[in-house]
């Protein structure tokens, strides 16, 4: 039987130091190219091997980035979001939303009236 898939959403503040080749990740999303339907938010699409984000280890592909150095990423064009990161300076603070998939056991297993008690 299939289990129900739920999501656990958590937020985290991640402070990155720009490395010799930058922050080391790619983003998708923005008001002009929604990555998630009805959501113009900015999402991490790729973490570059040996880049600053990969070496830090906390930022994950699929994370939603809510703000950069306290600046909200809501309602931005994709390129405006990219430019915000590129101009964010040496020390960069990211507020991110992790969405973890949680598997809830098979539907109907030990439901009401199940004699296996």
């Amino acid at each position: 039987m299939n289990g129900r898939v739920d999501y656990l959403v958590t937020e985290e503040e991640i402070n990155l130091t720009r490395g010799p080749s930058g922050l080391g990740f790619n983003i998708v999303g923005g008001t002009d190219q929604q990555y998630v339907s009805n959501d113009s938010g900015i999402y991490v699409s790729r973490i570059k091997e040996n880049g600053a984000a990969a070496l830090d280890g906390r930022l994950q592909e699929g994370d939603k980035i809510l703000s950069v150095n306290g600046q909200d990423l809501k309602n931005l064009l994709h390129q405006d979001a990219v430019d915000l990161f590129r101009n964010a300076g040496y020390a960069v603070s990211l507020r991110v939303q992790h969405r973890l998939q949680v598997q809830n056991g098979p539907i109907g297993h030990r439901g009401e009236g199940d004699p296996s008690g």
Partner: nanobody
């Protein structure tokens, strides 16, 4: 991803000009950041010029500013590098690169996912 094919390289005398072309195949070519890099014999690959996807902003290495011009024709899925006042030190294999969504500057090779095979430019 996009497939990239460079052309236009060759042998030219110092002070001469060449125009390199980079033809891309793939959807949404106009959204990609495009860059030119070069590798001279015995040297590291270095950034030459780049043009952003959505706005067409251009960036140049100090060594080519005022001599090289990058441009793009999205209708033809092609990026160009016009090289004027060529010098012997411009001799290298020139590579075209495409990337999307990197939060890092376009001068970084890591900002690009797709690369062409390169075209040789020799300035005598």
């Amino acid at each position: 991803h996009v497939q990239l094919v460079e052309s236009g390289g060759g042998l030219v005398q110092a002070g001469g000009s060449l125009r390199l072309s980079c033809a891309g195949s793939g959807r949404s070519f106009s959204s990609y950041d495009m860059g030119w890099f070069r590798r001279a014999p015995g040297k590291e690959r270095e950034f030459v010029a780049a043009i952003s996807g959505s706005r067409g902003s251009t960036y140049y290495a100090d060594s080519v500013k005022g001599r090289f011009t990058i441009s793009r024709d999205n209708a033809k899925n092609t990026v160009y590098l016009q090289m004027n006042s060529l010098k012997p030190e411009d001799t290298a294999v020139y590579y075209c690169a495409a990337g999307f969504g990197s939060v890092d500057g376009l001068e970084y090779s890591g900002s690009y996912d797709d690369w062409g095979q390169g075209t040789q430019v020799t300035v005598s």
